[in-house]
């Protein structure tokens, strides 16, 4: 796949990593996570125009078919290519524990 | 994540595997693939409502933040969870070769 990194829609409009500041209340975790109470959530947001950060040949196919049948086949979508781990301190039956989550924060993004 | 498999939007409306019949011309492969001339492309299409086939905790977060900030954070997106391989017979400089592609046909789907 041709993984173009120049966004034809203008700077920052295409699929890329964004940081969203969120409280535990925002995330729906207030009842089971003790700390941190605020999180910098990294996620993949933005458009996936032709040839932009195509993850694989499936993404290429999807774009070609989307052009032909836009009502049937959606454009590729901006999703995490990999994740960063994160620590949450949570309440357990026996007290308090440090817990690592591997699939929580996007590390980088591509179009699928 | 709670991977609900019942679509609250009605049968077939949520993220699932679809088969799209496509020619090599549709796919943009006519100049380098000899066979097959037509492909049953399996791809992931459909909506990702709350708790439906959430791939991981990131998808859960994304949905919660989408509810709060729909203009900033998009809903999770229906993408392949895994792929089926496919063999293409293609032209090479020296003739013809059988080539296996591992990332071409979606095998199953989830929401990320």
């Amino acid at each position: 796949a041709r993984n173009g990194d120049r966004c034809p829609l203008g700077p920052g409009r295409c699929c890329r990593l964004h940081t969203v500041h969120a409280s535990l209340e925002d995330l729906g975790w207030a009842d089971w996570v003790l700390s941190p109470r605020e999180v910098q959530v990294t996620m993949c947001i933005g458009a996936c125009p032709s040839q932009f950060r195509e993850a694989n040949m499936h993404a290429q196919i999807k774009m070609n078919l989307h052009r032909l049948k836009p009502d049937t086949v959606p454009a590729p979508c901006c999703v995490p290519a990999s994740y960063n781990p994160m620590v949450l301190i949570q309440k357990t039956d026996t007290g308090v524990s440090l817990q690592t989550y591997d699939d929580l924060l996007a590390k980088d993004c591509h179009c699928v | 994540a709670r991977n609900g498999d019942r679509c609250p939007l009605g049968p077939g409306r949520c993220c699932r595997l679809h088969t799209v019949h496509a020619s090599l011309e549709d796919l943009g492969w006519a100049d380098w693939v000899l066979s097959p001339r037509e492909v049953q492309v399996t791809m992931c299409i459909g909506a990702c409502p709350s708790q439906f086939r959430e791939a991981n905790m990131h998808a859960q977060i994304k949905m919660n933040l989408h509810r709060l900030k729909p203009d900033t954070v998009p809903a999770p997106c229906c993408v392949p969870a895994s792929y089926n391989p496919m063999v293409l017979i293609q032209k090479t400089d020296t003739g013809v070769s059988l080539q296996t592609y591992d990332d071409l046909l979606a095998k199953d789907c989830h929401c990320v």
Epitope: L34, P36, E38, V87, I89, S97, L98, L105 | -
Partner: antibody, heavy 119, light 107 residues
Framework: QVQLVQSGAEVKKPGASVKVSCKAS????????INWVRQAPGQGLEWMGW????????NYAQKLQGRVTMTTDTSTSTAYMELRSLRSDDTAVYYC????????????WGQGTMVTVSS | DIQLTQSPSSVSASVGDRVTITCRAS??????LAWYQQKPGKAPKLLIY???SLQSGVPSRFSGSGSGTDFTLTISSLQPEDFATYYC?????????FGGGTKVEIK
Amino acid sequence: QVQLVQSGAEVKKPGASVKVSCKASGYTFTSYGINWVRQAPGQGLEWMGWITAYSGDTNYAQKLQGRVTMTTDTSTSTAYMELRSLRSDDTAVYYCARGPGQYADVDVWGQGTMVTVSS
Amino acid sequence: DIQLTQSPSSVSASVGDRVTITCRASQGISPWLAWYQQKPGKAPKLLIYAASSLQSGVPSRFSGSGSGTDFTLTISSLQPEDFATYYCQQANSFPITFGGGTKVEIK
């Protein structure tokens, strides 16, 4: 800027108690936990325990269990560490430190409070 | 409890030298290892977190690497202000633990 300011030095007799304070500023106090770490003269760093400013839940080092109590006062953004039944080997500099954050970072430390236990 | 073993316990080096300190954990803690610098009479200062992330404001001559149980702090070109004691620390699980420290002295 983010700051943790601790109370002044203390001299205590064996068997007594000490209560060290740690006042936070420059961030939302309830968003992070506070660790207490001590350092005996010429020695390394020893973690004593952690408290979440949000709910008061704690996790103490096993060797100090029963002798240490950590509390917070959210109205003044202050954390406290009380150590009872003091012994001479409790003589140390006591630090408060914010964290761990989402990347397990203990990023901001107080200036330290010297506690001397001597008869 | 997770034990952290730091080596060497002390190192003599000159300004401009490359200095490497290692930290070995008794079990996997990837990537939750941090490195601190401490000068006499001062509180520890966070240099590196999550094994390799440079804390804001820390000079780029400091770098961290490693995963699993074996981690390294490297000072690429030692500066006069870098003579201090360095500690590794894990926050993979409670209790949080520290390495024994490495004193970097002037040769």
